[in-house]
Every structure is written in structure tokens, then in C-alpha cells.
Interface confidence: medium
């Protein structure tokens, strides 16, 4: 776990787990079939998902100055996606196999968020949007949209932890 009082997290552990997250996110939503045929419906959107942006202090300078801003943002995102993956969007029909990568992804998101959460310290978490598609195909489409935005999120997080492990580890 991260040490209380805003000290550095276990960068190397975080790096390893975030790399695993990247692999799982891509296996949960790889390209399938004749991708020219893929086109999104506009039934549901995932505009409310967290993004790591310029002002979040996740750039090399920001991480050097105070990594807590960036780590808090990453933590919020991890909790947000962990909640989404545990919601009926993913547990409802169409059913996923019990050992699907989504299940492993869910557990790994929780693992990394716990690694970042300082003991006795609770960062604010973002409210997940109330997305409840009525049709199974809409739910399936929403799953893929969520997974695609998660791929982007964990890719940035993995780069942050790789940088931290290389330059900020004690």
C-alpha cells in the first residue's frame, strides 16, 4: 500500500499491476471479426468516464513536484471503472463466462486502487453515471465503449507508473 501522509506509492508494484491491467483490458475488448463492419450506435454514451488530463499533474514535472494529485486522479478512475465492471451493465445479459477477462480486470482494478489508497485516507470517488440499457445488444455495445475508454485510461496510468518506477522509486 501507499504510505500514509502522502508519501510515494510502491511504484514498481503499481507498474507491474498497471501493465497487467493493460493486457487484460485489451483481451476483454480486442478487435473481433471484419472490423470495417463496426460502427457505433448512439443509444448510450460514456462521456462521463474519467480521463487523465493535462492539469492532473501526471506529466513528469507534476509527478516530481507532487505525485499525489496524479495518483488521486488515477485512483478515482480505477474505482469508477471497478464499479462499472461490477454493475448490471456487465453482470446482465448477454452473460460472460465466469473466467472471462472482465472478471480478472475487475479484480485487478480493485487491487491497484487498494495499492494506491493510503491507510486511513479516503480520496473522493466519482459518481458512476446511471446507465441501464433496456436491450441486451445496447448493453453489449455499452460494455465495449466502456472497455475502450478503460484501455485508454490504463494505458496512461501504466505510463505514469513506468515513469515513477524508473525515476521516483527510492
Amino acid at each position: 500500500r501507499a504510505v500514509p501522509g502522502g508519501s510515494s506509492p510502491a511504484w514498481t508494484q503499481c507498474q507491474q499491476l498497471s501493465q497487467k491491467l493493460c493486457t487484460l483490458a485489451w483481451s476483454a475488448h480486442p478487435l473481433v471479426g471484419h472490423m470495417d463492419l463496426r460502427e457505433e450506435g448512439d443509444e448510450e454514451t460514456t462521456n462521463d468516464v474519467p480521463h487523465i488530463q493535462c492539469g492532473d499533474g501526471c506529466d513528469p514535472q507534476g509527478l516530481r513536484d507532487n505525485s499525489q494529485f496524479c495518483l488521486q486522479r488515477i485512483h478515482q478512475g480505477l474505482i469508477f471503472y471497478e464499479k462499472l465492471l461490477g454493475s448490471d451493465i456487465f453482470t446482465g445479459e448477454p452473460s460472460l463466462l465466469p473466467d472471462s477477462p472482465v472478471g480478472q480486470l475487475h479484480a485487478s482494478l480493485l487491487g491497484l486502487s487498494q495499492l494506491l489508497q493510503p491507510e486511513g485516507h479516503h480520496w473522493e470517488t466519482q459518481q458512476i453515471p446511471s446507465l441501464s440499457p433496456s436491450q441486451p445488444w445496447q448493453r453489449l455495445l455499452l460494455r465495449f465503449k466502456i472497455l475502450r475508454s478503460l484501455q485508454a485510461f490504463v494505458a496512461v496510468a501504466a505510463r505514469v507508473f513506468a515513469h515513477g518506477a524508473a525515476t521516483l522509486s527510492p
Epitope: H29, P30, V32, L37, R38, E39, P94, L97, W137, F144
Partner: antibody, heavy 124, light 111 residues
Framework: EVQLLESGGGLVQPGGSLRLSCAAS????????MVWVRQAPGKGLEWVSS????????HYADSVKGRFTISRDNSKNTLYLQMNSLRAEDTAMYYC?????????????????WGQGTLVTVSS | DIQMTQSPLSLPVTPGEPASISCRSS???????????LDWYLQKPGQSPQLLIY???NRASGVPDRFSGSGSGTDFTLKISRVEAEDVGVYYC????????FGPGTKVDIK
């Protein structure tokens, strides 16, 4: 009620052309992938062609590639299949169907509902 | 292309009794994303096909719960817990992992 209604089938000589139509109602046609599937008399089902909601991308079975063209007019809620250079082996009942599976696999699947079909007979 | 086989090709059934149809693919239909890309369709006599099961095991809207799909990889099964007279017709499996291909069909009729 979600409905698909095919038309345009008939008797045509080998080498001839036909244009099939599929009129959709009861759903927002412009949001859905659509497909054509055919069934030769007394035989099984064969996927023919698919099209994305905008009409901007299409895909064909090898057996019809270069001869058939799938298209759609979202303003008219209608799907089309232009069939040229017809052969005896194209004789079949042609069904259009709404394709829900393209949101999980680019190949499609999960076809629901299907139209009642239109019969195409290629014979001299 | 992936080849699909079904067995039996003909299945005489007794109303009230269970029935089972097997579908095999020449390669696994289980994708790494956790979905089996297999559908089941029923074509009743003189009618167009109708969707029964999608993605291996999910019952389509309006399909009676006596129908169930199971299996993974290359071996799939469609079960009817208690056959009714209206269940007669030809049952097709279809793979959607690669270029779409249907099985040859299983004709179910009353004994």
C-alpha cells in the same frame, strides 16, 4: 411492432439482374446493421451480405462478390440488394434481417427479426 | 472458413419429452473476450427463421424458457426441456467469429 418486408423477387434468366428491397418498420432503421441471408430450395441458410448503419461499409460472401451490391436508404427505411450476372445457383428465398451482433463481432450474427422472404428464380 | 456440423440431422420427438441438438465447429468459437460467437435459429415449416439463442447461451427476447443453449469452444448444445408441438421445424446453429457460416440444420418433427 418490428417488421421487415422483402419484395422484388421473381423469375429471371441467367445473366440477368434483379433488385430486392426490404422495407423496415417499428424501429429506428438508421441505427442498425442489416444483412441479407438466402436459402436455396430444400437447402440450408447462407449469409449473403452485410451493411453498417450509415451504409458506408459493406461485406459479401465469396459466392456473390463482384455481382451483388447491398445498399440502404435510411430516409426511406429501406434495404436493397442489387443482383447482377445472376446464375442458376442464385435461385433461393432471400431474407433480410436486422443484425444485432455486429456490436460484438464485426462479422455480425444475432439476427432478429427476419423478413418473410422473397423468392428469386434464375432459369432459362 | 469455419465449418459447422450438427447432429442428429433428423430428430423425431415426443411432446413433453426433452430433446437435444449438438453443434460442432471446426475451430473454437470462444474469443479471448469471454464470448462464444454462436447463435441458434429455428425455422418453422413455411416460415422464416427466428433467433432462439445468441452468443452461445443467451435466450432471445420472447423465446420460451424451455429452450437453453450451452457449451463453449467447439461443442455446443441446444436443449428443449419439454418439447411442444409448435417446436417442430429445422434448427440451425451459426458461427459469427469469422465469415458467417450456418450448420446444415437439424429437422425436428413429432414421432
Amino acid at each position: 411492432e418490428v417488421q421487415l418486408l422483402e419484395s422484388g423477387g421473381g423469375l429471371v434468366q441467367p445473366g440477368g439482374s434483379l433488385r430486392l428491397s426490404c422495407a423496415a418498420s417499428g424501429f429506428t432503421f438508421s441505427r442498425y446493421h442489416m444483412v441479407w441471408v438466402r436459402q436455396a430450395p430444400g437447402k440450408g441458410l447462407e449469409w449473403v451480405s452485410s451493411i453498417v448503419p450509415s451504409g458506408g461499409s459493406t461485406h459479401y460472401a465469396d459466392s456473390v462478390k463482384g455481382r451483388f451490391t447491398i445498399s440502404r436508404d435510411n430516409s426511406k427505411n429501406t434495404l436493397y440488394l442489387q443482383m447482377n450476372s445472376l446464375r442458376a445457383e442464385d435461385t433461393a428465398m432471400y431474407y433480410c434481417a436486422r443484425d444485432l451482433g455486429s456490436y460484438s463481432s464485426g462479422w455480425g450474427g444475432w439476427f432478429d427479426p427476419w423478413g418473410q422472404g422473397t423468392l428469386v428464380t434464375v432459369s432459362s | 472458413d469455419i465449418q459447422m456440423t450438427q447432429s442428429p440431422l433428423s430428430l423425431p420427438v415426443t411432446p413433453g419429452e426433452p430433446a437435444s441438438i449438438s453443434c460442432r465447429s471446426s475451430q473454437s468459437l470462444l474469443h479471448s473476450n469471454g464470448y462464444n460467437y454462436l447463435d441458434w435459429y429455428l425455422q418453422k415449416p413455411g416460415q422464416s427463421p427466428q433467433l432462439l439463442i445468441y452468443l452461445g447461451s443467451n435466450r432471445a427476447s420472447g423465446v420460451p424458457d424451455r429452450f437453453s443453449g450451452s457449451g463453449s469452444g467447439t461443442d455446443f448444445t441446444l436443449k428443449i426441456s419439454r418439447v411442444e408441438a409448435e417446436d417442430v421445424g429445422v434448427y440451425y446453429c451459426m458461427q459469427a467469429l469469422q465469415t458467417l457460416t450456418f450448420g446444415p440444420g437439424t429437422k425436428v418433427d413429432i414421432k
